[in-house]
Amino acid sequence: AFGISGVQKYTRALHDSSITGISPITEYLASLSTYNDQSITFALEDESYEIYVEDLKKDEKKDKVLLSYYESQHPSNESGDGVDGKMLMVTLSPTKDFWLHANNKEHSVELHKCEKPLPDQAFFVLHNMHSNCVSFECKTDPGVFIGVKDNHLALIKVDSSENLCTENILFKLSET
């Protein structure tokens, strides 16, 4: 148990981390679901996209998200790792030209249409809390993760290392 400082230790210097190169090291098309197997879906409503967390009916097709993986380097004076402190950052795009964004003021996750280069709000540090689950930490707000709240995606502050494994910030990626 690390307490609050443990999470801060894990997440320090995210603000200063630089993404090495402008092209992703890989891209992966996957459906996104919660730890409890609810699907993340995207619906076009009034010319903007809404994000939902819901149970799909049997045989209903899951929405796919393009995850683009970027290498990010920690500054050596921050991480103590020299050039060795690499992280993976991802952007998530459910449809062409739209990306998930962290709205830190509203504690919300939104879909925005934008051009590259993408703003920092579109980048999330990839964590594996379990072998088959991932979590997405805001590049712009260390210690804040995409999570599920009231059947929507929201930004959730994680204030202790124990809470890094709470189910509402865990997601599953699936090719099917």
Epitope: Y10, T26, G80, D81, G85, L126, N128, S131, L164
Partner: antibody, heavy 122, light 107 residues
């Protein structure tokens, strides 16, 4: 410079126990998943155990599940493998490895220790 | 479990040859595929990760390609120090699995 140094190997009788240690230095240990990989004499590589960077999750193949336990002590920058009910087929060089990136498992194992030999024989 | 089948299990080649080693997965997965080189009595060395990304410090004559179930390691011009055993490894799904290895010997 990243360094991983294993210790604790040796000769043990079938059914016996052994505890391997891996001393890590040169990087922020508690940010990385850590993994044990073994190699039987003249054979290929086999994954043995992995532990999350938080220490909250541990994973094993069926061949060692229930007999081996991976653990970590972040205060000591150390990784451990407790091996019980050892069998002849566990004879191998055991390597301590580190993940490529902070916080996750992607990207293979860029750092390996020198290995420690475990021999299970009567 | 994802089985990784490497071929050939051994090959003989000369310095300057182009060498190709393949790894076939029993099921498709994201490209979390790594290639390692191992010399006798030494620890494995990571050459390629993410199927095609060259690890820092590895000579550019090594390259990786492939996706889904078929992956390839290519050495464009074999050098004397490249005679070794090569392993592929998938990290996409647990249990993590390695290929059986390819021993590259001097012709």
């Amino acid at each position: 410079e990243v360094q991983l140094v294993e210790s604790g190997g040796g000769l043990v009788q079938p059914g016996g126990s052994l505890r391997l240690s891996c001393a890590a230095s040169g990087f922020t240990f508690n940010n990385y998943w850590m993994t044990w990989v073994r190699q039987a004499p003249g054979k290929g590589l086999e994954w043995v155990a992995s532990i999350t960077y938080t220490g909250g999750g541990t994973y094993y193949p069926d061949s060692v599940k229930g007999r081996f336990t991976i653990s970590r002590d972040d205060a000591k920058n150390s990784l451990y493998l407790q091996m019980n009910s050892l069998r002849a087929e566990d004879t191998a060089v055991y390597y301590c490895t580190r993940a490529n990136y902070y916080y996750n498992t992607y990207g293979g194992f860029p750092y390996w220790g020198q290995g420690t030999l475990v021999t299970v024989s009567s | 479990d994802i089985q990784m089948t490497q071929s050939p299990s051994s090959l003989s080649a000369s310095v300057g040859d182009r060498v190709t080693i393949t790894c076939l997965a029993s099921e498709g997965f994201s490209n979390d595929l790594a290639w390692y080189q191992q010399k006798p009595g030494k620890s494995p060395k990571l050459l390629i990760y993410a199927a095609s990304r060259l690890q820092d410090g590895v000579p550019s004559r090594f390259s990786g390609s492939g996706s889904g179930t078929d992956f390839t390691l290519t050495i464009s011009s074999l050098q004397p120090e490249d005679f070794a055993t090569y392993f592929c490894q998938q990290g996409s799904k647990y249990p993590l699995t390695f290929g059986g290895g390819t021993k590259v010997e001097i012709k």
